[in-house]
């Protein structure tokens, strides 16, 4: 099919670059003839260092090709992304980042974990890819619910907490108010809506401290709020239904033995919060002496019968409703309770299956007489709000 054009010279035979091939292969290439270069799998077309998706050259009248020959260069995925709170190891060889090289991501042991196995391979598209086909690096998620606390300790009727007992405990300080919260991720705090309602439009004025036992300790980790999310069903000053809020922190905090999120309840957790099951609440609120606690105090308290609690409060404060979004805890005989200044703190339970602590309740409201007989503490029932919590966290 070759037609030698007048006054035109044939072009030099194109030589396929290493790891590449040329098509079509012809005995001679003359004016307007063309060839394309294709690279083997794991190699890419580069013109200098610039990637090309395809390459076709055309023979010109003067007997030269209109484009310089590219190369087929081995795919290089480049240095893998850094992993916050983790590290990457080169498996194939030191700093080897080319096609089929393998790397292994790992999280800092004890305090962080990843959902995948962390193994990534440099694939032909030039991206580090996991066995599940993920192109983004894994995430080191904070471990939740690890504590040195054990149930059985005999706030009001409480005992001082030891280091590592309640690493999720957060102190919320306003100009004139103090409340608590629970770390549920490395940049999210769960608390009671009523405790932060006044700050909702001025989040930055809320001072958040964590990693402390002594309320006035100078050795705290400071966190600043970015935004406060009050549950849309909460009406300030009209009862305590939906008394739940989330605080997004400006920065992620580093997780360690004294700062760690509490777990959120699994679906199966409802069975661990039945009447008479024991939970633990900690706080710097009023103690039996009527003074704010200097040291973080905790108390182990049983879940109260919901109907009995509802009846008590109907009698005590007519018009104040104990809703299905609340759970009550305390002894019929009194003596163990949370109190003013504990608001927003977590009522936690040990999940026997996972051996992790999860938040079942948020300190919400109760009788003016903390720890009085037959007058239970009322807590926001967190399990009812898991979809709300997950929705806020995933969207913001």
């Amino acid at each position: 099919h070759h037609h030698h054009h007048h006054a035109s010279r044939p072009c030099p035979d194109p030589t396929a670059p290493p790891n590449g091939s040329i098509s079509p292969v012809q005995a001679i290439y003359v004016l307007k003839d063309r060839f394309s270069v294709f690279c083997k799998t794991g190699f890419e077309l580069l013109q200098g260092s610039v990637p090309l998706k395809s390459f076709t050259a055309v023979c010109q009248k003067d007997g030269s090709w209109d484009r310089p020959m590219p190369e087929c260069s081995i795919i290089d995925c480049g240095p893998p992304d850094d992993l916050p709170n983790g590290h990457v190891d080169y498996i194939t060889g030191p700093e080897v980042t080319t096609y089929k090289a393998v790397i292994q991501y790992s999280c800092e042991e004890t305090f962080y974990t990843m959902s995948s196995n962390g193994k990534y391979v440099c694939e032909a598209d030039g991206f580090w890819t996991s066995s599940k086909g993920e192109k983004l690096p894994p995430v080191c998620e904070p471990v939740c619910g690890l504590s040195t606390h054990t149930i059985g300790g005999r706030i009001v009727g409480g005992q001082p907490a030891k280091p590592g007992d309640f690493p999720w405990q957060v102190l919320l300080l306003g100009q004139t108010t103090a409340a608590a919260g629970a770390l549920i991720h490395d940049n999210w705090v769960l608390t009671a809506a009523h405790a932060v309602y006044e700050k909702r439009m001025a989040a930055s004025s809320l001072n958040i401290r964590m990693g402390i036992l002594k309320r006035l300790s100078p050795h705290y980790t400071q966190a600043w709020p970015e935004e406060i999310f009050i549950h849309e069903g909460y009406t300030h000053g009209a009862g305590f239904d939906n008394d739940i809020a989330l605080i997004k922190l400006k920065n992620k905090v580093t997780i360690n033995g004294s700062i760690m999120p509490v777990c959120l309840p699994r679906k199966e957790a409802a069975s661990l919060m039945r009447t008479d099951f024991t939970g633990t609440v900690a706080g710097w609120g009023l103690t039996q002496k009527g003074l704010l606690a200097r040291n973080l105090m905790f108390v182990d308290i049983p879940i109260a019968d919901h109907q009995k609690c509802t009846a008590v409060y109907e009698k005590l404060y007519p018009g104040v409703r104990v809703s299905a979004n609340m759970l009550c805890a305390g002894l019929e005989t009194g003596g163990k309770d949370s109190c003013r200044g504990d608001a927003g703190g977590a009522l936690v339970f040990l999940d026997n299956e996972t051996q992790r602590w999860f938040v079942g309740g948020i300190v919400s409201w109760g009788s003016i007489n903390c720890g009085a007989a037959d007058q239970y503490g009322v807590y926001t029932k967190v399990i009812n709000y898991i979809p709300w919590i997950e929705n806020i966290i995933s969207n913001f």
């Epitope: 013109q47 200098g48 610039v50 990637p51 590219p70 480049g78 030039g126």
Partner: antibody
Framework: EVQLQESGPGLVKPSQSLSLACTVT?????????WHWIRQFPGNKLEWMGF???????NYNPPLTSRISITRDTSKNQFFLQLNSVTTEDTATYYC??????????WGQGTLVTVSA | NVLMTQTPLSLPVSLGDQASISCRSS???????????LEWYMQKPGQSPKLLIY???RRFSGVPDRFSGSGSGTDFTLKISRVEAEDLGVYYC?????????FGAGTKLELK
């Protein structure tokens, strides 16, 4: 014919991030080639900053690696430059460009970015 | 980094003259694939640079044939056979063989 147009704020405060967009018309940024950012300092010195390829892979000028990110939005046929922790030394005219068998065959008209308190 | 040194920094010419700009690189620009990625760009005041020549001697589309490029290894030249008014501006050589790629400081072509 392919056309490129830079856009973004003309004034950035020191220590903040500089963010620019390059809108491409007449050619899809996923079809082929590499898409570059280049800057020209007062005094006319030119510096290549980095590129994003048709496949989305990036290559940066080593001194800028810790501060630069080039990303894209294929649905809008745009690619972006983000330069963090800027100083007055980052004051320049920023250009986007496209390569072929050469590095910069097609250029945008450039946008001046001043870094000043 | 490869240093690109242009001479002269300023080149006064008369219209119709031949102009020659030299560019020297601090190391060979022959790429491992055998090509030499040396390019020339021209910039007029208030405009973006425009590509004139690539891989030493190939003219970019639409570039008049009065522009020619030559050289090898570390020494390269851009010639304009007959300077026209529209050719006045700043000329930059550029190397794309070694990353990071680098530009020369520029040569200003101006009227005598």
């Amino acid at each position: 014919e392919v056309q490129l147009q830079e856009s973004g704020p003309g004034l950035v405060k020191p220590s903040q991030s500089l963010s620019l967009a390059c809108t491409v018309t007449g050619y899809s940024i996923t079809s082929d080639y590499a898409w570059h950012w280049i800057r020209q300092f007062p005094g006319n010195k030119l510096e290549w900053m980095g590129f994003i390829s048709y496949s989305g892979r990036t290559n940066y000028n080593p001194p800028l690696t810790s501060r630069i990110s080039i990303t894209r939005d294929t649905s809008k046929n745009q690619f972006f430059l983000q330069l963090n922790s800027v100083t007055t030394e980052d004051t320049a005219t920023y250009y986007c460009a496209r390569s072929y068998d050469y590095w910069f065959g097609y250029w945008g008209q450039g946008t001046l970015v001043t870094v000043s308190a | 980094n490869v240093l690109m040194t242009q001479t002269p920094l300023s080149l006064p010419v008369s219209l119709g003259d031949q102009a020659s700009i030299s560019c020297r690189s601090s190391q060979s620009l022959v790429h491992s694939n055998g090509n030499t990625y040396l390019e020339w760009y021209m910039q007029k005041p208030g405009q973006s640079p425009k590509l004139l020549i690539y891989t030493v001697s190939r003219r970019f589309s639409g570039v008049p044939d009065r522009f020619s490029g030559s050289g090898s290894g570390t020494d390269f030249t851009l010639k304009i056979s007959r300077v026209e008014a529209e050719d006045l501006g700043v000329y930059y050589c550029f190397q794309g063989s070694h990353v990071p790629v680098t530009f020369g400081a520029g040569t200003k072509l101006e009227l005598k």
